[in-house]
């Protein structure tokens, strides 16, 4: 569906800045990007190209089955969570209980969910009772983001917790699809 | 809580175009699915498009293609619906509608106040 | 596109039960079309009862429930008040395209 594939292991992203520029805040930030036809906005990259090389932000993924009361998922989900601490990218072990983490004595930089996807997922029921299909909410990626003491409250709530709810994500596309190619592309998926 | 206010009434021509607004509070616009649909008065509702976080792209009504465009200013919280080319039969309330947060992707729970657009020679 | 069908107008009496359903022109319509069901009364802004076949909302009174009878997304009101006549639109998912059927004006007479 137009996501990568997830493995079921820990991995390390470095967010590259030069493919998409911020437009300037006073424009509409999609005016063009966020159309149909364009696939909608890019990926929402918060610190200057100077950061690129030097922080990077690790994702878990682990897999698990959905519940619903009594219902389970009849196939586990792959979840992502983001993982603490972004730290330069050299610095951070490829695996988790290697390494040090770094910890900033300057600005706070934050590892946190950037995208969300929602996943079909149809879930069994016991005692005859009738299976139910519903959509889960997963973390499609995560992103370092800079926090100084100048943050406002507002600008914090992104923090809450690890699985607050991310950006939702678009995926560059060449053109708006029709309702007939969405369905078959559902159908050959499930 | 989720709350969405939209822009007042319009009058215009056909031909032309109108673009409706929806300020988003209590949340922010990056993390919601917006979705847009209309009621003509009288009738029924009808879907006209909106964000699909499974393929992670805008989705329009075949009905609507190529006149629609539905855009997002995250600096203002605020989505916007341009309907070009109006004919008289575009007249109608246009109503903004967003998900809810949770484990569940649940579209259409928190509704805008409508925009009745009015198009008339 | 597909055609969702309901019920144009059904009549209830008070602490009666009636069911509304909502068909596609697609084939029998399953939990993979996600069905919603939404009120509408004169002058407001729709608003959702049941997501998901049957799932309902925080808002949603106890006297609603959603299923699936014989191939349709069927609506359940057990128990009618005067409050509940409006008019009802079900929605159905068709992969991301959602069609909304003509609604049903609910009448509790």
């Known amino acids: 569906q137009g996501w990568q594939a997830f493995k079921n292991d820990a991995t390390e992203i470095i967010p590259e800045l030069g493919e998409y520029p911020e437009p300037p805040p006073e424009l509409e930030n999609n005016k063009t990007m966020n159309r149909a036809e364009n696939g909608g906005r890019p990926p929402h990259h918060p610190f200057e190209t100077k950061d690129v090389s030097e922080y990077s932000c690790r994702e878990l993924h682990f897999t698990r089955y959905v519940t619903d009361g009594p219902c389970r998922s009849a196939k586990p989900v792959t979840e992502l969570v983001c993982s603490g601490q972004c730290g330069p990218a050299r610095l951070l072990p490829n695996a988790i209980g290697r390494g040090k983490w770094w910890r900033p004595s300057g600005p706070d930089f934050r590892c946190i969910p950037d995208r969300y996807r929602a996943q079909r997922v149809q879930l069994l029921c016991p005692g005859g009772e009738a299976p139910r299909a519903r959509k889960v909410r997963l973390v499609a990626s995560c992103k370092c983001k800079r926090l100084t003491r100048f943050h406002n409250q507002s600008e914090l709530k992104d923090f809450g917790t690890e699985a607050a709810r991310p950006q939702k994500g678009r995926k560059p596309r060449p053109r708006a699809r029709s309702a007939k190619a969405n369905q078959a592309e559902l159908e050959n998926a499930y | 809580e989720v709350q969405l206010v939209q822009s007042g009434a319009e009058v215009k021509k056909p031909g032309a175009s109108v673009k409706v607004s929806c300020k988003v509070s209590g949340y922010t616009l990056s993390e919601l699915s917006m979705h847009w649909v209309r009621q003509a008065p009288g009738k029924g509702l009808e879907w006209m498009g909106g964000?699909?976080?499974?393929?992670?792209?805008?989705i329009y009504a075949q009905k609507f293609q190529g006149r629609v465009t539905m855009t997002e200013d995250t600096s203002t919280d605020t989505a916007y619906m341009e309907l070009s080319s109006l004919r008289s039969e575009d007249t109608a309330v246009y109503y903004c509608?967003?998900?809810?947060?949770?484990?569940?992707?649940?579209?259409?729970?928190?509704w805008g106040q409508g925009t009745l657009v009015t198009v008339s020679s | 596109q597909a055609v969702v069908t309901q019920e144009p107008s059904l009549t209830v009496s008070p602490g009666g039960t009636v069911t509304l359903t909502c068909g596609s022109s697609t084939g029998a319509v399953t939990i993979d079309h996600y069905p919603y069901w939404f009120q509408q009364k004169p002058g407001q802004a729709p608003r959702t009862l049941i997501s998901d076949t049957d799932d309902k909302h925080s808002w949603t009174p106890a006297r609603f429930s959603g299923s699936l009878l014989g191939g349709k997304a069927a609506l359940t009101l057990s128990g009618a008040q005067p409050e509940d006549e409006a008019e009802y639109y079900c929605l159905l998912d068709y992969g991301g395209t959602f069609v909304f059927g003509g609604g049903t004006k609910l009448t509790v007479l």
């Open positions: 964000f699909d976080p499974e393929v992670g792209e805008l």
């Open positions: 509608a967003t998900d809810t947060d949770g484990y569940w992707e649940k579209f259409f729970q928190h």
